[in-house]
């Protein structure tokens, strides 16, 4: 025998108190699939969260973070403070990257400069707290009598720091 609740579409719930009719989800609640026996309460984007997408009878609200913060976790479950480029967030707040490290974003951690010598290259542009070093041609390529000079490697695009 078919469950009468299976006929209840998204946006409704199967109301056992009312002979299993499909009642519309009350305001501030939703059901994203059919056959539900209850509607879920809409997420409220409060405080440091702000509403990116309003709740509806069939879908939950979606939040993002107010300016100066960024999302962390699935579905923006947390908001973390932004820092400036050249900084990382610690338990004591935003701290400048130590010498030899950089951060080119407002989030994430400071990462070590690229070691050009590991690739047999020289440092073309020094690193800063905000930017990685730029590696240039290998010293051998610049020695007298070299038949050709390899053009300097272009500065790489700022990458996304690991989360």
């Amino acid at each position: 025998l078919q469950d009468p609740c299976s006929n209840c579409p998204a946006g409704t719930f199967c109301d056992n108190n009312r002979n299993q009719i499909c009642s519309p989800c009350p305001p501030n609640s939703f059901s994203s699939a059919g056959g539900q026996r209850t509607c879920d309460i809409c997420r409220q984007c409060k405080g440091v969260f702000r509403t990116r997408k309003e709740c509806s009878s069939t879908s939950n609200a979606e939040c993002d973070c107010t300016p100066g913060f960024h999302c962390l976790g699935a579905g923006c479950s947390m908001c973390e403070q932004d820092c400036k480029q050249g900084q990382e967030l610690t338990k004591k707040g935003c701290k400048d990257c130590c010498f030899g490290t950089f951060n080119d974003q407002k989030r994430g951690i400071c990462r070590p400069w690229t070691n050009c010598s590991l690739d047999g290259k020289s440092v073309l542009v020094n690193g800063t707290k905000e930017r990685d070093v730029v590696c240039g041609p290998s010293p051998a390529d610049l020695s007298p009598g070299a038949s050709s000079v390899t053009p300097p490697a272009p500065a790489r695009e700022p990458g996304h720091s690991p989360q």
Epitope: N7, I21, C22, S23, P27, S56
Partner: antibody
Framework: EVQLVESGGGLVQPGGSLRLSCAAS?????????PCWVRQAPGKCLEWIGC?????????YDANWTKGRFTISRDNSKNTVYLQMNSLRAEDTAVYYC?????????????WGQGTLVTVSS | DIQMTQSPSSLSASVGDRVTITCQAS??????LAWYQQKPGKAPKLLIY???TLASGVPSRFSGSGSGTDFTLTISSLQPEDFATYYC???????????FGCGTKVTVL
Amino acid sequence: EVQLVESGGGLVQPGGSLRLSCAASGFSFSANYYPCWVRQAPGKCLEWIGCIYGGSSDITYDANWTKGRFTISRDNSKNTVYLQMNSLRAEDTAVYYCARSAWYSGWGGDLWGQGTLVTVSS
Amino acid sequence: DIQMTQSPSSLSASVGDRVTITCQASQSISNRLAWYQQKPGKAPKLLIYSASTLASGVPSRFSGSGSGTDFTLTISSLQPEDFATYYCQSTYYGNDGNAFGCGTKVTVL
């Protein structure tokens, strides 16, 4: 412009039938909206007739007195809701309103048509 | 079935008066109640939903309260444009769940 426009009213003899239409413009019916029919006899109270789910399923909610005589249906491709009225009686004479019942307005009727007059008389 | 009983059925008042209209449901409807204003020859206009939330564009002199079975609409200071008929409606969906009260006509004293 966001509006509801009713049509199909007029004079009908007792025992006759009539189909009223309610065309929505400026928005589309969805699970957030339940189009409803409400009527008001001359000088009388508002009387709820029923509503239909705004999404793709044919779920209707009706006042018990309508059973067997009044049927609500919907054509989503035309963004239109209908009220089929059969076995009409003199006491069905009223202005018939189409209203949009909205989830974000606590299922209150946040948008109403201008109404269409149905007169049942011989 | 849910029945809605409104009182009084009519009242007379003057501009500036505080007006209170009550509505009683025959069973608990939580906060699922709407209030409407209707003027002669016009469609109803939503004033308040979810018992106490003011609809968009409605002046703040209108307020609603109540939950369960007993509800109130208050006009804090009656204005000339407020003379009209006011209806409550259960928005507790389901068959016979959306009944209206029979209205309160507010006229000039």
